[in-house]
Interface confidence: low
């Protein structure tokens, strides 16, 4: 009678994350009695995953009936496979011994890959914020994807950015990898809107690719600018001084107001105008009362931007560009009249 | 029905020791049997099986340092290449099925000291 | 791989009160969770299997319960000699398993 084959038809398979995976073996002959065990890889260290005489194999079942006497199929259906099952089985008939069985035959074994979806990417941007002009770095992981194959992109508002450095880890053979790609980002004072995007495509995500996004209206800081101008008001020997804040971005700003280089007020912005580009404009104003000044006034509108070191711009009023009241027994107004801004 | 463990001793390191499991009132060709170990002050660590056919399973750690096998009264654990890491007590244990599934006689304990 | 972890890693009990202790695995395990108690210098005892069933001889103050992935322990009517190590251990697969036990809770009884 010709020698029992261990028949392992399927050299290998590949099987989704959560799914189950069903073994083929078969044999040739009910010679010589023995059990059947199963094992994952070959060698010493080769891992029990079924035995048909004993054991308990929760994950594991039978595909044919093993009771009946004339049974020759051996395959086994594992179930809920996670990337941790891969490797290659091996069908090993035994032959009955005493007081251990020994190994007689073995099939050519089958490899399992298991394909897992790659997790949702995150990225994540500088820590500090930074001006427009300025090249800045995003960074995107995703992790627990098999096979290792996946292509990565990086987009800036749907154009796609080549500046970029991708690695998958780890480089050797493993259950499951992951990814990490550094993108170096030019900012531009139109950024407070915009978006960074990094796309993972992969086998398990049947063309429908992952995404995660950064704003850049977190990273990005737009500098102010400033405008000092004066309009004569309708009062005599007052004049209306303001400071246009322009184009800033984040909100947070605070705006000092110094007469010959001493302050004289300190507001917060409130009340902001926002512009179609995400940055924002906001205006103080000071009346200025020249009938109490003898000599030229200079007025410093100084600006404190997100923590930032302060900018400034300075108007000379010229006090002899106004008529002076002439024996007034009254005594002079308070030279700066605080007002709320506009 | 009992089993207990013999051949801890204090070892230099890298010198291989094999650990004893005799039992008695029963059959390793009905149980599995289990070796598991317990450094000073810590838990219970899992280390592999035998089954009644001889086949044998490993923790994850304990893969290439450690080897069991059997006759048909006595149930070995091999400590290849021992570190300091290895000093514990170790337990040889029966399981309560012909598998793999709980522990429900134990040995008292044999300890191995890998010391300089 | 399946991972178990207990809580907490020690508790304090008087004499006539209850202990809870709780075991949780990373996987879904259905009842395959055994409970030991281990005494200083002595070896482990099985207490509970299959998540609820007392082992022989043991004492029903013990009590297992869950199913799943949360399993719970609950001694209750303390008693001084129940001062010990509990270890809670899945016995659902070994396949690919770095622990097969939980890192134990110490029951201190005053």
């Known amino acids: 009678e010709e020698e029992l084959q261990v028949i392992q038809p399927d050299k290998s398979i590949s099987v989704a994350a959560g799914e189950s995976a069903t073994l083929h073996c078969t044999v040739t002959s009910l010679i010589p009695v023995g059990p059947i065990q199963w094992f994952r890889g070959a060698g010493p260290g080769r891992e029990l995953i079924y035995n048909q005489k004993e054991g308990h194999f929760p994950r594991v079942t039978t595909v044919s009936d093993l009771t009946k006497r004339n049974n020759m199929d051996f395959s086994i259906r594992i179930s809920n496979i996670t990337p941790a099952d891969a490797g290659t089985y091996y069908c090993v008939k035994f032959r009955k011994g005493s007081p251990d069985h020994v190994e007689f035959k073995s099939g050519a074994g089958t490899e399992l890959s298991v394909r897992a979806k790659p997790s949702a990417p995150v990225v994540s941007g500088p820590a500090a914020r930074a001006t427009p002009q300025h090249t800045v770095s995003f960074t995107c992981e995703s992790h627990g994807f098999s096979p290792r194959d996946i292509t990565l992109k990086w987009f800036k508002n749907g154009n796609e950015l080549s500046d970029f450095q991708t690695n998958v880890d780890p480089a050797g053979d493993s259950v499951s990898y992951s990814i990490h790609s550094t993108a170096k980002v030019v900012l531009t004072r139109e950024d407070v809107h915009s978006q960074v995007i990094c796309e993972v495509a992969h086998v398990t995500l049947q063309g429908d690719p992952l995404r995660g996004t950064a704003n850049l209206s977190e990273t990005i800081r737009v500098p102010p600018t400033l405008e000092v101008t004066q309009q004569p008001v309708r009062a005599e020997n007052q004049v209306n001084v303001t400071c246009q804040v322009r184009k800033f971005y984040p909100q947070r700003l605070q705006l000092t107001w110094l007469e010959n280089g001493n302050v004289s007020r300190t507001e917060t912005a409130s009340t902001l105008t926002e512009n179609k580009d995400g940055t924002y404009n906001w205006m103080s104003w000071l009346l200025v009362n020249v009938s109490a000044h003898r000599d030229d006034v200079k007025l410093t509108c100084q600006v404190e931007h997100d923590g930032q070191p302060a900018v400034s711009k300075s108007h000379d009023l010229k006090v002899s560009a106004h008529p002076k009241e002439q024996g007034s027994n009254t005594a002079p107004g308070p030279a700066l009249a605080s007002a709320a801004p506009l | 029905q009992s089993v207990e463990e013999s051949g801890g001793r204090l070892v230099t390191p890298g010198t291989p020791l094999t650990l004893t499991c005799t039992v008695s009132?029963?059959?390793?060709?009905?149980?599995?049997m289990h070796w598991v170990r317990q450094a000073p002050g810590k838990g219970l660590e899992w280390i592999g099986i035998?089954?009644?056919?001889?086949a044998t399973s490993y923790a994850t750690w304990a893969k290439g340092q450690f080897t069991i096998s059997k006759t048909s009264t006595t149930v070995d654990l091999k400590i290849t290449s021992p570190t300091t890491e290895d000093t514990a007590t170790y337990f040889c244990?029966?399981?309560?099925?012909?598998?793999?599934?709980?522990?429900?006689?134990w040995g008292p304990g044999t300890l191995v000291t890998v010391s300089l | 791989q399946i991972v178990m972890t207990q809580t907490p890693f020690s508790v304090s009990a008087v004499v006539g009160g209850t202990v809870t202790i709780k075991c949780q695995a990373s996987?879904?395990?259905?009842?395959?969770l055994a409970w030991y108690q281990q005494k200083p210098g002595q070896r482990p005892k099985l207490l509970i299997y299959?998540?609820?069933t007392l082992a022989s001889g043991v004492s029903s103050r013990f009590k297992g319960s869950g199913s799943g992935t949360e399993f719970t322990l609950t001694i209750s009517g303390v008693e001084s000699a129940d001062a010990a190590t509990y270890y809670c251990?899945?016995?659902?697969?070994?396949?690919?398993?770095?622990?097969?036990f939980g890192g134990g809770t110490e029951v201190v009884v005053k």
């Open positions: 251990q899945q016995g659902y697969g070994i396949s690919y398993v770095h622990n097969v």
């Open positions: 244990a029966r399981g309560d099925r012909d598998g793999y599934a709980y522990f429900n006689i």
């Open positions: 299959d998540a609820s």
């Open positions: 009132g029963f059959s390793l060709s009905n149980y599995a």
């Open positions: 035998i089954y009644t056919g001889g």
């Open positions: 996987h879904n395990i259905g009842s395959w």
